[in-house]
């Protein structure tokens, strides 16, 4: 049902869903801190623009009695329960910041008449693509898929002269929320990735993965997996790996690779890591000082959600436009705003664009080095290291199918 919004007469409220089930196991206190830091910045920006208004956040907590797994598996109804709570209390703000779980976001979007914008730090799955009033501030699975297809097809770089059309995908069901949906998208038979590949097999058992590493009859030299180096080591250990195997490790929300003192362990030599270009001003901020790299990105998405609302509020107020309209609800897309750590770009469907970075391990220095970057906004590759010191023969990535001649 329509809920009246606390969103007029110079007072603008943000409803923040504080759900027990979350994409990342982050103490809600840290998210509150991020939101409050964002509010301070927004108030300052509005004041500087000569807009004398009040902006506040209301934190809506789940009772945690029923939905208590802590991860996203039991999140489907939690979001709806919180919406019901908001509805009963007549406390809906101008914008809803919350659910990070794909299940809950999808269900909330499906089951409610959304005449207000919804901003999510997460909702990675393909089922949350192309939603008219949903904005996602962490890279969704679709963006990953587009990079992978682009990279697979590339054959005009001195270090990648073979187009690839095959892949194994390792997915054992214990993944984090982001990895679960990234791999889910790659697995889906109707996805862009599956459509563009000639061969793709999902490996679900540790042993399957381990056997492929030295199997002379393998159908692909390329294995995609998602997680950090430790996750790979647990699986691979110090096992021998055929020289033309390439492991693509998707680890988007982890900037440890860019730290000065990091040395790549030996088991990473035949691995390409896909991560996001790191921020720099986060390290000293009050809300992120005690956060791990992954949680920093999650908290940052909450903070940027507040800044995005402030950006849109400023535009609408300056134009003398009403905030509680479908126009406002549909406006959170196809724009660039000033985020906490620099400009943030949203695509036509409200999904954040970013610079993905593909790293390799230098056999000379044992350091992670940038091979190339990829701008998801324009789907363009920018080569960085034209003569990488790879472990692979001739400093080139191998063909994806052993024994296939030059292309």
């Amino acid at each position: 049902s329509q809920v009246s919004q606390n969103c007029h007469n110079g007072s603008y409220e943000i409803s923040v869903l504080m759900m027990g089930n979350s994409a990342f196991a982050e103490p809600l206190k840290n998210l509150e801190d991020a939101v409050n830091e964002g509010l301070e910045i927004v108030r300052g920006r509005l004041q500087n623009a000569g807009l004398n208004v009040t902006v506040n956040a209301t934190f809506m907590y789940s009772d945690g009695l029923i939905h208590n797994s802590g991860d996203c598996r039991s999140s489907t109804c939690e979001g709806l329960d919180l919406l019901r709570k908001i509805s009963n209390a007549q406390r809906m703000g101008c914008v809803l910041i919350g659910p990070s779980c794909t299940y809950s976001t999808f269900q909330m979007y499906l089951d409610t008449e959304l005449s207000y914008p919804m901003i999510s730090a997460g909702s990675f799955g393909l089922s949350c693509d192309y939603k008219e009033t949903l904005t996602r501030l962490m890279s969704p699975a679709r963006k990953l898929m587009y990079f992978l297809v682009n990279f697979w097809k590339t054959n005009d770089l001195p270090f990648k002269t073979y187009s690839w059309s095959t892949s194994y995908v390792y997915k054992n069901g214990t993944e984090t929320e982001d990895c679960f949906w990234y791999l889910n998208a790659l697995e889906a038979s109707v996805s862009y990735f599956s459509h563009e590949l000639g061969f793709k097999v999902v490996l679900r058992q540790d042993k399957e993965f381990q056997d492929i590493l030295m199997d002379h009859n393998r159908k692909s030299n390329v294995i995609i997996m998602c997680g950090g180096p430790e996750f790979l080591y647990k699986l691979k250990g110090d096992r021998a790996v055929a020289e033309d195997i390439v492991i693509i490790l998707v680890d988007l929300f982890n900037d440890q690779y860019f730290e000065d003192n990091v040395t790549a362990p030996d088991y990473m030599k035949n691995v390409l890591v896909l991560t996001l270009s790191p921020g720099n001003s986060l390290l000293n901020s009050s809300f992120s000082r005690n956060l791990s790299p992954t949680k920093r990105d999650f908290a940052l998405a909450y903070l940027n959600g507040i800044l995005l609302f402030g950006h849109m509020l400023k535009i609408f107020l300056e134009n003398g436009e009403n905030i509680t309209t479908p126009k406002f609800a549909h406006a959170f897309r196809n724009l660039t705003f000033e985020g906490y750590d620099g400009p943030v770009t949203l695509d036509d469907w409200g999904d954040v664009d970013s610079t993905m970075v593909l790293l390799y391990t230098s056999v000379d220095t044992k350091k992670y080095k940038v091979l190339l970057t990829y701008d998801t906004h324009v789907n363009k590759t920018y080569p960085v290291d034209m003569s990488p010191t790879f472990t692979w023969k001739n400093s080139k990535l191998p063909n994806d199918i052993t024994g296939r001649g030059p292309q």
Partner: antibody, heavy 118, light 106 residues
Framework: EVQLVQSGAEVKKPGASVKVSCKAS????????MNWVKQAPGQRLEWMGV????????NYNQKFKDKATITRDTSASTAYMELSSLRSEDTAVYYC???????????WGQGTTVTVSS | DIQLTQSPSFLSASPGDRVTITCSAS?????MYWYQQKPGSSPKSWIY???NLASGVPSRFSGSGSGTEYTLTISSLQPEDFATYYC?????????FGGGTKVEIK
């Protein structure tokens, strides 16, 4: 409009060094690799090296590894190439060229003539 | 390093002629790139990835080929086309250039 403006011609004595600059404008300097190419009189073009201004990654042609040093000043959107221990065979026109993959070397500077003569 | 051999080195032709320049690579490459250079000027990107015309290049130019043999063709030579054309590969590191083909007025 993309422009690469190089420093003026230089005449140097053998054994000296020279630093050629290439100022970029009309695009984001850190978004594109910058190449350096040598054209000696009557010789084919020779690729010397490439630098990524964002990450500072530099790859040299083995032939020029001990001859050229490539640097950059991102705040000034300028790439530099220094040539050391100059000899007569270093007499050439040196070009900077932007890499706009997949169109390698899509824009070139006007060239800097370096003459080495005693 | 991959060696690129262009033929002919010199070519005399008249306006309106069809002109073909060949570039042979010492080993197979996926793509070839072409540049035009006029006396006293810097090279200009002309054709990239074998057959894509760079911005502003007239449609009378075309590129083709695969493996070790690539060609640049001018369907009807115009006065402004008289220049030197260089082929270049970036299949292997380091990138290398051909020796050039000078197209002169007959």
């Amino acid at each position: 409009e993309v422009q690469l403006v190089q420093s003026g011609a230089e005449v140097k004595k053998p054994g000296a060094s020279v630093k050629v600059s290439c100022k970029a404008s009309g695009y984001t300097f850190t978004d594109h690799n910058m190449n350096w190419v040598k054209q000696a009189p009557g010789q084919r073009l020779e690729w010397m090296g490439v630098m990524n201004p964002k990450f500072g990654t530099i790859n040299y042609n083995q032939k020029f590894k001990d001859k050229a040093t490539i640097t950059r000043d991102t705040s000034a959107s300028t790439a530099y190439m220094e040539l050391s221990s100059l000899r007569s065979e270093d007499t050439a026109v040196y070009y900077c060229a932007r890499d706009n993959y997949p169109n390698y070397f899509d824009y070139w500077g006007q060239g800097t003539t370096v003459t080495v003569s005693s | 390093d991959i060696q690129l051999t262009q033929s002919p080195s010199f070519l005399s032709a008249s306006p309106g002629d069809r002109v073909t320049i060949t570039c042979s690579a010492s080993s197979s490459v996926n793509y070839m790139y072409w540049y035009q250079q006029k006396p006293g000027s810097s090279p200009k990107s002309w054709i990239y990835r074998t057959s894509n015309l760079a911005s502003g290049v007239p449609s009378r130019f075309s590129g083709s080929g695969s493996g070790t043999e690539y060609t640049l063709t001018i369907s009807s030579l115009q006065p402004e086309d008289f220049a030197t054309y260089y082929c270049q590969q970036y299949h292997d590191y380091p990138p290398t250039f051909g020796g050039g083909t000078k197209v002169e007025i007959k």
